[in-house]
Interface confidence: low
Amino acid sequence: MPNSEPASLLELFNSIATQGELVRSLKAGNASKDEIDSAVKMLVSLKMSYKAAAGEDYKADCPPGNPAPTSNHGPDATEAEEDFVDPWTVQTSSAKGIDYDKLIVRFGSSKIDKELINRIERATGQRPHHFLRRGIFFSHRDMNQVLDAYENKKPFYLYTGRGPSSEAMHVGHLIPFIFTKWLQDVFNVPLVIQMTDDEKYLWKDLTLDQAYSYAVENAKDIIACGFDINKTFIFSDLDYMGMSSGFYKNVVKIQKHVTFNQVKGIFGFTDSDCIGKISFPAIQAAPSFSNSFPQIFRDRTDIQCLIPCAIDQDPYFRMTRDVAPRIGYPKPALLHSTFFPALQGAQTKMSASDPNSSIFLTDTAKQIKTKVNKHAFSGGRDTIEEHRQFGGNCDVDVSFMYLTFFLEDDDKLEQIRKDYTSGAMLTGELKKALIEVLQPLIAEHQARRKEVTDEIVKEFMTPRKLSFDFQ
């Protein structure tokens, strides 16, 4: 993405006012729920961009005091808009995708640098995962603290999650789980996986039963990633909240120490949002504290939590880290991943509701081939001649991006990068290389998923003592 500054604060301020009017008029008229939701999301996104740029909340009666000078080159000449990231919206105007270095600065996290990767290698005695080596997990909060604890034989545990919005999971959804499995293996630590079926019930047009059934179905895909049944607890919020007083007590503690104003500022909630949405962040925060799982950790409150997640989930955990010391708990540490790009390009996060935006875990070999050939955005030239002469652009080519996620062989990947950039490899050949990686990967996943019986799911989802051997 070009190194550009966001639109001036005054422009942003005016855009919010305009968008606010639009939302009000849509609500007053006969607009569809989708139209209203989309307009509200845009409003929230603008408000959060304003807060990030101004360092304070947008207030309708308080225009920015020192607006940045506006461009005098006319509207068509303005630089690309600032990326926007929150738990529900990911927007960038760049074909390369989000500018992650800028995001680190904006979110106040730390870059996963060579030094940290080397330290992980030393601590575990294992070669760092290619997600680390390739900057797919690119940002962290307090990972050095986790390594300090680990090196001093102090325990920690992993926490990640999934919002089960539909039965169909796509390959992008696997990223945090693939990495979390590696973390579990190399550090030999317990793992809790939260299925936020309650969140999906609140945000989507689902019944409670549907939300829960999605959680169970998604759990099968997660289990198929190879998690150790003796070290992993998968739980549905709808199920576990009612049976764990430790968990619910922490939810209430968090709710007591976070104000509505704070969650409005962090998540952009509006007065028309149901109260379930407003209190939900406390439920996603609670697994960060070890005594939410008395069957695993008894009542210990001092066990550090490490959360691998996509960067869009960071607002939840910024709130969690803020509230932790106020309720006497350690702050959870975080490892952030980049977004998995949609087939159509890196400008947005994929959606499970658009079947052509991604490769689904249920896709057949033929569907994979068709989708990649037909929908994967290409960084190649318009003609073979031009491509041979000028080469392709790996920075925007989705097939190459997917290979960085799924082709483990560094040498092969580097050879493909060189060949495609030089023009020696054509777009069709690059797509073929990706298809040859994805087809067996998905087929193997489907085979493993078939072996996940209801009994296995039940065991993973039963609160119980976990087995691990902290050394």
């Epitope: 325990p155 003796n230 950790f297 008894r298 210990r300 119980r464 051997d469 902290f470 050394q471």
Partner: antibody, heavy 121, light 110 residues
Amino acid sequence: EVQLLESGGGLVQPGGSLRLSCAASGFTFSSYDMSWVRQAPGKGLEWVSAISSGGSSIYYADSVKGRFTISRDNSKNTLYLQMNSLRAEDTAVYYCARDVAWDMLGDFDYWGQGTLVTVSS
Amino acid sequence: QSVLTQPPSASGTPGQRVTISCTGSSSNIGSNYVYWYQQLPGTAPKLLIYANSQRPSGVPDRFSGSKSGTSASLAISGLRSEDEADYYCGAWDDSLSAYVFGGGTKLTVL
């Protein structure tokens, strides 16, 4: 029902050896750290040794270091205590105990009924 | 000589409240959880209090535990004859890398 059943105790001469076993049932043995705790006649409890669930972390009381070896066979659901160079002061009832805390904190929620070891000439 | 210090005996009449103390140091009670065990005559010990103050299921709420700094205490209210037993406190000791017990307190119900 959780059960821990010790065996292998008996009379042994000073300098001799004994191997105690603790057969576990009613729970997933491989998920739990285990300890041996002893009690000399008319005396208090003394922790002897602990082993983590997978067997990689082992701890001993100073009084038995270098003489006793704790081990486990998760496939047989059995905990062992190999006792060498026995002394008169090792005479005690030996209990095996399940540690429910996940990082060996001594949260002994289940105990066996004990096996008596007598070291005497 | 035990690492954790308990009074050798305590007594009370039925219905009374008695407290048993357990004193340690920064490397055991000061930095780890305290556990209390009850040993009835001729039986194996039984977990009474875990994590300083938590009761396992089945333990009556007449038993309560607390911890402050490097000391802990077990309180028994509404004393009953069946509470006559030996009581032991225990904690992990970081400097010894070992689990340590108190010497035990013999509780007599008069």
